[in-house]
């Protein structure tokens, strides 16, 4: 892969950074799983979806998740009206109506319903990382990444370049 | 304004070693991926290296590995390229090129620095 | 390593028409949905500039002149309407795998 790039250090939010499109460049439908091979599953229970890492048994089908990818500018470190380049985030869908949100305050990843224009929560930063595995930034607060904890998905903060192939933020995206 | 500036080339000797180096500005450098990219005097464009933001990576293209080693001083933000047992075919214009946030192209190149190996 | 293989090698364009350059990879250069073949702009004397990223997606400051399309392995960069400010060498870039690999370039001119 490109190798990795470092955390977000500005101090300004990725939440200052515009939608270049309000609809997405493309979409994916893909299973996803941790760097350990630990599968992200979805389940609807008491009217609500809750998400699970864990290992699938032999021949256990995948859970899919639609990735929308959206062209987004990148704001200047310099000042808040400056653009340094492009970047490209996703919103994550495992099943019709429902997206992955950020939930900052409670440093949890939770499913919500909920209709288009998405908020903001439900955006990340798609990282291309080294050894074929992505990561994903919040949009809302920079230097947060989904992650893995206790077998559940958390928000985790990374605080340095160096702690950003720590292996719980790493995820694998595959068609099967 | 996001700038690269490359600086140490010069012409040296087959075998001989140089040390390129890049001085960014304009973005926070310790958060992006770095490379250098040549081009011969062919203007055929050639990937060299890559460096993770947090050092973590490198990869080079075969040609150049373990004679060309790539590393970053993020406190004087600033790239480097060590090469040695330089080859007639190492010959080339090298560009420091910083990858977009997230990592998934080249976005910003220098202006670059020349290289040129010959007896 | 992928192979790009860029066509024509050199093309010459009327002011106000459009140039169409080609590129084609030797293998899938799709990773994670995304077609992962970035267009490079290059004038005498000075470095590459990003054109198009992702195979369809114009970098910061491209004009809307500048488009890119295609997938898998077949793309293309078309320039329309072509301006005197275009006189310039193309180059196709997969981002895909290491080796990052680029085509060997279009030389484009005014007719």
């Known amino acids: 892969a490109f190798g990795i790039s470092g955390v977000q250090k500005y101090t300004r939010a990725l939440h200052d950074s515009s939608i270049t499109g309000i609809s997405p460049i493309t979409e994916y439908l893909a299973s996803l799983s941790t760097y350990n091979d630990q599968s992200i599953t979805f389940a609807l229970e008491d009217e609500s979806y809750e998400i699970y890492v864990e290992d699938l048994k032999k021949d256990e089908k995948k859970d899919k998740v639609l990735l929308s990818y959206y062209e987004s500018q990148h704001p200047s470190n310099e000042s808040g009206d400056g653009v340094d380049g492009k970047m490209l985030m996703v919103t994550l869908s495992p099943t019709k109506d429902f997206w992955l949100h950020a939930n900052n305050k409670e440093h949890s990843v939770e499913l919500h319903k909920c209709e288009k224009p998405l908020p903001d929560q439900a955006f990340f930063v798609l990282h291309n990382m080294h050894s074929n595995c992505v990561s994903f930034e919040c949009k809302t607060d920079p230097g947060v990444f989904i992650g893995v904890k206790d077998n559940h998905l958390a928000l985790i903060k990374v605080d340095s370049s160096e702690n950003l192939c720590t292996e719980n933020i790493l995820f694998k995206l595959s068609e099967t | 304004d996001v700038n690269l500036v490359e600086s140490g080339g010069g012409s040296v000797k087959p075998g001989g070693s140089l040390k390129l180096s890049c001085v960014a500005s304009?973005?926070?450098?310790?958060?992006?991926?770095m490379s250098w990219v040549r081009q011969t005097p062919e203007k055929r464009l050639e990937w060299v290296a890559t460096?993770?933001?947090?050092?973590?990576?490198?990869d080079y293209v075969d040609s150049v590995k373990g004679r060309f080693t790539i590393s970053r001083d993020d406190a004087k933000n600033t790239l480097y390229l060590q090469m040695s047992s330089l080859e007639s075919e190492d010959t080339a214009m090298y560009y420091c090129t910083r990858a977009n946030y997230g990592n998934w192209f080249f976005e910003v190149w220098g202006a670059g620095t020349t290289v040129a190996v010959s007896s | 390593d992928i192979v790009l293989t860029q066509s024509p090698g050199f093309l010459v364009v009327s002011l106000g028409q459009r140039a169409t350059i080609s590129c084609r990879a030797s293998?899938?250069?799709?990773?994670?949905?995304?077609?992962?073949l970035n267009w490079f702009q290059q004038k005498p004397g000075q470095p590459p500039k990003l054109l198009i990223f992702a195979a369809s997606n114009r970098g910061s400051g491209v004009p809307a002149r500048f488009s890119g399309s295609g997938s898998g392995t077949d793309f293309s960069l078309n320039i329309h309407p072509m301006e005197e400010d275009d006189t310039a060498m193309y180059f196709c870039q997969q981002s895909k795998e290491v080796p990052f690999t680029f085509g060997s370039g279009t030389k484009l001119e005014i007719k």
């Open positions: 293998e899938s250069v799709a990773k994670y949905g995304l077609s992962l």
């Open positions: 304009g973005f926070t450098f310790s958060s992006f991926s």
């Open positions: 460096i993770s933001g947090g050092k973590t990576f490198t």
